[in-house]
Interface confidence: low
């Protein structure tokens, strides 16, 4: 049986406390009562608390705990959120940079074959910009895609500049020569290794910084258990309940508390260190053929040495193209 | 010859800010990233340190509370909490990880996965796979790499010069950056802070 | 010599809206995240509301919704629009960058602290 309270006190304090935390005073005892009622401030002697402050506490409690986590995680949140859109935009200024370039190496080098090369070219790297957002596209087909539809312009209006104006169905046999005969020799297949492995890398580096900010998100928005509720209640407001207003809790008991809250969320840092280590190992190695500012902004001029690769070898390709695409040209010329 | 096509797109505004004592590259943006994400890498095992170093705590005080009783901060007592015959601290503990919790751990472990099989092995960064067939005189070697940026006075000179500084503030239009406010019901009424 | 200085506080009723500022000198804040903190007495600082160098804002839940961050970088100020302020939103205001802080450390360097401004938010 607790000791009655002595006949001069009052639970004044609490209740101006407790008003600020919730207006309406009905909660709060006048004077300090049993409180056998309560089930998380258990009272060794007299309390100013009641089971509905209790229940109150708790939320607040709660509540607290889900902010505290928020602001410890909001720096980290914003260097992730931020890195992530400048590398997005960074790399799409990379692919309008490298698209651009590659254009005024045609416009410049070759003419006659815009504004259709400026089609293709586009359209290569509209899906460059697709595959980097996540897109399901095959950069070894995009690359064949760039170079078949090429070679009928580079066919009709460089090397046999005296055909009428290429029909489908040349077309459709140069495309296919191109790849028999291997009119770009290894150039097609350079680019594709390059491209995709560069591209890759740098796909599978934004989704990491994405999945980063959905691991913040996750843990930012925890919802704590009834009984973290209970622990933090009687750790940071159960004192007031015996009048203690000024007192903190024990900074050994904070942690263990903590420790038994967060014992779930705590279960990340393994992955998390391994997660931040693994993108360290990823960035080191995005140079040269792995980063794609290097390649993409040097393609224009691989794409150029195909092109001298084609023409230096016009008139062997032509003798056998000739032959293989003849019955599509005679067609064309009826 | 082929043409250098640089002076083409250079912005005029761009020139303006040309002589930036630090030249910020993509790559140098990626390891600064990497350097301040390895500050964060003990995140998750110091965020209990971290709120109750944020929540009031007794630190100069000579008495705390234990969660039953004020005791001396030093004491036997300030160690043991007043949480005897009321729940199980083990139990909470051995509940494991919430469901959102679980998933968020299996996409990390495939992300991780991904990165790993990514990296580059040290020393490995040239592919000397192109085997189809020899190049003939004038294209490219064995090294895939010698290729970057073509041949001869075609050949651009890149060298990672995207400059954020100046191609952020001008080839993007910063005010169409889409924001992260998204409307949350905000909580209500509820003072969600410490009173002391 | 860095200098923030805050302004625009004062006392408005319940669900009335202020709009603070912060105006840096002696540093270039657009390179800055910076962000609005709060402090009511006797608690810790907290941190409301921040704005990334490519203009995203994130707040914390208390506020948003209610809250916009915004910078110009051109007159190195951000802002703090607060509409339906409540009670609890009564605290002194101040800015300082996002940049600097640290896991584990109650204040941090920063920008270095202003004078901050008074919300005050009562009927």
């Known amino acids: 049986q607790p000791p009655p309270p002595p006949p001069d006190a009052t639970c004044h304090q609490v209740r101006s406390f407790f008003q600020r935390l919730q207006p309406g005073l009905k909660w709060v005892p006048e004077t300090p009562v049993p409180g056998s009622d309560l089930q998380v401030c258990l009272p060794k002697g007299p309390t100013c608390c009641s089971r509905k402050m209790e229940e109150k506490y708790q939320l607040t409690a709660r509540l607290n705990m889900e902010q505290l986590l928020q602001s410890a995680s909001m720096e980290l949140k914003f260097l992730i959120i931020q890195n992530a859109a400048v590398f997005q935009e960074a790399f799409e200024i990379v692919v309008r940079h490298a698209k651009n370039y590659t254009n005024a190496m045609f416009k410049n080098n070759y003419p006659s074959l815009t504004p259709q090369a400026f089609e293709f070219v586009g359209e290569f790297f509209t899906d460059v910009s697709l595959y980097i957002l996540g897109s399901d596209i095959n950069v070894d087909d995009m690359v064949n895609e760039l170079f078949d539809s090429l070679f009928p312009v580079i066919y009709t209006q460089l090397m046999n500049p005296g055909l009428p104006d290429s029909a489908l169905d040349i077309n459709e046999c140069l495309r296919g020569a191109r790849r028999d005969l291997k009119v770009f020799g290894n150039f097609p297949k350079l680019i594709m290794t390059q491209v995709s492995k560069s591209l890759q890398v740098t796909r599978i580096f934004l989704q990491a910084l994405n999945l980063g900010i959905e691991v913040i998100n996750t843990t930012d928005h925890l919802k704590f258990s009834k009984d973290c509720g209970r622990m933090l209640t009687r750790m940071w407001y159960c004192s007031y309940c015996q009048g203690l207003m000024m007192v903190k809790p024990c900074g050994g008991y904070c942690n263990v508390v903590m420790q038994g809250c967060m014992a779930g969320v705590v279960e990340i840092d393994k992955y998390w260190r391994e997660y931040i280590l693994s993108l360290e190992e990823l960035v080191n190695g995005m140079y040269r053929i792995y980063d794609m500012e290097n390649v993409l902004l040097g393609l224009f001029s691989t794409i150029h040495d195909s092109i001298q690769y084609v023409q230096k070898n016009a008139g062997k390709l032509t003798t056998t193209i000739g032959k293989l695409c003849a019955h599509s040209q005679q067609r064309q010329y009826r | 010859s082929a043409y250098y096509p640089e002076d083409l797109f250079i912005d005029k505004k761009v020139l303006k800010v040309a002589h930036v004592e630090h030249e910020e590259t993509l790559s140098s943006r990626r390891r600064e990233l990497i350097q301040k994400l390895k500050s964060f890498i003990s995140f998750y095992s110091a965020l209990p340190g971290y709120i109750c170093s944020h929540s009031p705590v007794a630190e100069n005080d000579t008495l705390c509370w234990n969660g039953q009783e004020l005791v001396e901060r030093y004491s036997q007592k300030a160690a043991r909490n007043g949480m005897k015959n009321q729940f199980n601290l083990h139990e909470l503990k051995m509940k494991g990880p919430e469901p959102v919790v679980s998933q968020i751990i299996d996409k990390l472990k495939h992300i991780n996965q991904l990165l790993r099989t990514m990296s580059v092995p040290k020393g490995r960064v040239l592919d000397k796979n192109l085997d189809e067939e020899g190049f003939e005189s004038g294209d490219c070697g064995d090294d895939e790499d010698e290729c970057i940026g073509g041949s001869g006075d075609g050949m651009m000179k890149v060298k990672n010069q995207l400059r954020f500084l100046a191609e952020l503030a001008y080839d993007l239009d910063v005010d169409d950056v889409p924001g992260n406010n998204q409307q949350a019901t905000p909580k209500d009424n509820e003072i969600s802070t410490f009173h002391n | 010599q860095v200098q923030l200085v805050e302004s625009g506080g004062g006392l408005v009723r319940p669900g009335g809206s202020l709009r603070v500022s912060c105006a840096a000198s002696?540093?270039?804040?657009?390179?800055?995240?910076m962000a609005w903190y709060r402090q009511a007495p006797g608690e810790q600082r907290e941190s409301v509301a921040a704005i990334s160098t490519t203009g995203r804002s994130i707040y914390i839940d208390a506020v948003q919704g209610r809250f916009t961050m915004s910078r110009d970088n051109a007159k190195n100020t951000v802002y703090l629009q607060m509409n339906n302020l409540k009670p609890e939103d009564t605290a002194v205001y101040y800015c300082?960058?996002?940049?600097?802080?640290?896991?584990?450390?109650?204040?941090?360097?920063?920008?270095?602290w202003g004078q901050g401004t008074q919300v005050t938010v009562s009927s």
């Open positions: 300082n960058s996002a940049d600097d802080l640290k896991i584990g450390t109650q204040y941090f360097k920063g920008l270095g």
């Open positions: 002696g540093v270039d804040i657009s390179t800055y995240t």
